[in-house]
Structure formats: structure tokens, C-alpha cells
């Protein structure tokens, strides 16, 4: 019971973690900087892995795409795989793990395959989960490292004088968005290789009994089967084979519908 | 690295019209803002007209009725008409952007300039 519980719950938080993941990725305020001293319109910019958007204080948006690869910094094109290797991978797992769940019964579909589908599907959500985290960070101190470079730079370019614009700036959205279900998915893929160790079918029942004949310490007796069974004169279950048969973990438990020996 | 192109300016008789254009390249994600300011001999630079990216607009005080500002955000174009002119809008023209270059990297560009001599 415990174990379905862990699996599902594993299951429930790295579907919200991949769902976070996926929202992270395709949001645009991963970065945002409020522009000001502007003769014309307050204006508030904010940028995503995909597209460049500003907004004025009318309400006025415009959103441009990056249509350019090779323009891009290597950075953020680092991130995007990052976050778009995180996406697969999660989806990938998601689909696995439901075969995996123990509370879906698909045909005759032994523990064995279900402990492994759930260890498989925990090791993606965890890496998911870890690609996702690093993509947010590699970003977040892309913006710092960009900060502190940009501070105060004022150079001549070719066409006039180009000075960097101090703005206030913050994280956007996204990134707080992308670390949390990061966090949820690595969460979750942990819990379902935690389940996975409940599910695994225990050892063999079939136990190796040695028989240990030493001379001096086990007595043969007539009608030894029977009072051994409790058939015969022993009726008080003493134990006769003093020596003799033993599990290799010395005592055997509980017999068990597998113990046929 | 952001590139300012202005084209337009001359000499000009006093009533007469002129048309300033400024085209921007290089690296650009966006240009919030577009306007011209100008400066002449002995004075302050001071804004002459601007207008952002969903064409609002604002004019100084010397210029307004006169001056048309407009943008062509397709091809990161601003354009300035120029009418009525008079011989106290001589001065040196410059084309200013605000130019969002890189992922949290906003720069401010100014033109070289273009003379206007109204005389």
C-alpha cells in the first residue's frame, strides 16, 4: 500500500514538475528590465528563450521572435536544449511510468517489469528535472554576468555613440517557474526509484535446505517422521533432528504458498 | 554591435520641407523607442520629436504642428517631415534609439548627425 502510495505520488509531482517545465520554456518573461528616463512612453521590456517583447505604459505590446540561430548568444541557445532535453526526457517518463504504476493492471505484467519501468522512469525525471534547474541557472547568471559587464560601458560605434542603458533588472517569472518544477520533477523521480525498491519481488522462496549429518548429534529414531509431523509418540513437538535441517538463514520463517520443499 | 544610417538633411529656403530618415541594423531583438534631437551652434541638444514601438508620440515645444514623426518597425526605420521650416530649426540632427540588443542588454544608439540649414 505504502508503495503505491510513493509511486503515485512520485507519478502526480513529476507531472506537475514536467507541466511546469513545459510552461517555463514556452513563457517570455525570463528576463525583465523596466526602462526609464524615456521623453516618450514608460516602457517595460522582457525577454524569453524564444521571442523579445516591450510594452508600453499604454498598453501597447510588440513581440519579436529570434529568427536568427546563429546571432543568438551560445548561451541561451545552451538553454534551450537544456530545457527542451528536460521536456523529452519527462515526457518520455511520464509515458513509462504509467505503464509502471501498480494500481494499472496492463495484461500479465510481472512485478519485475513494473520495478524496472518504475526505476527507468525515476532516473529520467530526475535527470529532467536536473537539465531544467541548470538551464534556469545558466540563464539567471547569463543576466548577472551581462549586468555587471554592462555596467557604466559607454563606447563609439561606427554609426555614433552607443552607450548601455543602466536599468533596474529582475528575474522574470519564469525563472522562479522553472526551478520550482524542476525541483517538483527531481522530487517525483526520486520518489519513484524509492518505489521501485518496494516493488521489486522479494528473494526467492525456494531456500537451500543443508542437511548436516554429524553423527554424535542427530538421533534416529523409529516414528521419527511421525513425531516430527506430530503424528506419533512426540507429541509435545520436541525436536528431534537437534542438528539437522536448516535453512541457510538458520531458521526458516513462516512458510510461505512457494515453500514446496 | 547596433549601426545608425541618417539620410535626408540639407539646405533648405525658410517654408520649405525636408525629410530625415534613420535606419537601424545590427543586432536588434526590439527597439522600444525612435526620435531625433538636435543640436545647434552654442545651445543644448534638445528632443525634437520620438515615437515607440505602438506609435505614441511626443513633440517639443518648438516643433509641434510642424514636425511629423513616423516609423517603419518592419524595417527598424524612423522617419522625420520636416514642414514649415524656419531658420531657428538650423542645427545638427541626430537619430537616437533605444535598442534591445541582447538578453538583458539595452543600449542607447545616437547617429553621427545630419545638418539642416534653413537659410
Known amino acids: 500500500m505504502a508503495v503505491t502510495a510513493c509511486q503515485g505520488l512520485g507519478f502526480v509531482v513529476s507531472l506537475i514538475g514536467i507541466a511546469g517545465i513545459i510552461a517555463a520554456t514556452c513563457m517570455d518573461q525570463w528576463s525583465t528590465q523596466d526602462l526609464y528616463n524615456n521623453p516618450v512612453t514608460a516602457v517595460f521590456n522582457y525577454q524569453g528563450l524564444w521571442r523579445s517583447c516591450v510594452r508600453e505604459s499604454s498598453g501597447f505590446t510588440e513581440c519579436r521572435g529570434y529568427f536568427t540561430l546563429l546571432g543568438l548568444p551560445a548561451m541561451l541557445q545552451a538553454v534551450r536544449a537544456l530545457m527542451i532535453v528536460g521536456i523529452v526526457l519527462g515526457a518520455i517518463g511520464l509515458l513509462v511510468s504509467i505503464f509502471a504504476l501498480k494500481c494499472i493492471r496492463i495484461g500479465s505484467m510481472e512485478d519485475s517489469a513494473k520495478a524496472n519501468m518504475t526505476l527507468t522512469s525515476g532516473i529520467m525525471f530526475i535527470v529532467s528535472g536536473l537539465c531544467a534547474i541548470a538551464g534556469v541557472s545558466v540563464f539567471a547568471n547569463m543576466l548577472v554576468t551581462n549586468f555587471w559587464m554592462s555596467t557604466a560601458n559607454m563606447y563609439t560605434g561606427m554609426g555614433g555613440m552607443v552607450q548601455t542603458v543602466q536599468t533596474r533588472y529582475t528575474f522574470g517569472a519564469a525563472l522562479f517557474v522553472g526551478w520550482v518544477a524542476g525541483g517538483l520533477t527531481l522530487i517525483g523521480g526520486v520518489m519513484m526509484c524509492i518505489a521501485c525498491r518496494g516493488l521489486a519481488p522479494e528473494e526467492t522462496n525456494y531456500k537451500a535446505v543443508s542437511y548436516h549429518a554429524s553423527g554424535h548429534s542427530v538421533a534416529y529414531k523409529p516414528g521419527g517422521f511421525k513425531a516430527s509431523t506430530g503424528f506419533g509418540s512426540n507429541t509435545k513437538n520436541k525436536k528431534i533432528y537437534d542438528g539437522g535441517a536448516r535453512t541457510e538463514d538458520e531458521v526458516q520463517s513462516y512458510p510461505s504458498k512457494h515453500d514446496y520443499v | 554591435q547596433v549601426q545608425l544610417q541618417e539620410s535626408g538633411g540639407g539646405l533648405v529656403q525658410p517654408g520649405g520641407s525636408l525629410r530625415l530618415s534613420c535606419a537601424a541594423s545590427?543586432?536588434?531583438?526590439?527597439?522600444?523607442?525612435m526620435g531625433w534631437y538636435r543640436q545647434a551652434p552654442g545651445k543644448q541638444r534638445e528632443l525634437v520629436a520620438g515615437?515607440?514601438?505602438?506609435?505614441?508620440?511626443n513633440y517639443g515645444d518648438s516643433v509641434k504642428g510642424r514636425f511629423t514623426i513616423s516609423r517603419d518597425n518592419a524595417k527598424n526605420t524612423v522617419y522625420l517631415q520636416m514642414n514649415s521650416l524656419k531658420p531657428e530649426d538650423t542645427a545638427v540632427y541626430y537619430c537616437?534609439?533605444?535598442?534591445?540588443?541582447?538578453?538583458?542588454?539595452?543600449?542607447?544608439?545616437w547617429g553621427q548627425g545630419t545638418l539642416v540649414t534653413v537659410s
Open positions: 537616437n534609439v533605444l535598442v534591445v540588443s541582447g538578453i538583458g542588454s539595452t543600449l542607447e544608439v
Open positions: 515615437i515607440s514601438t505602438g506609435g505614441t508620440t
Open positions: 545590427g543586432s536588434i531583438f526590439n527597439i522600444p523607442v
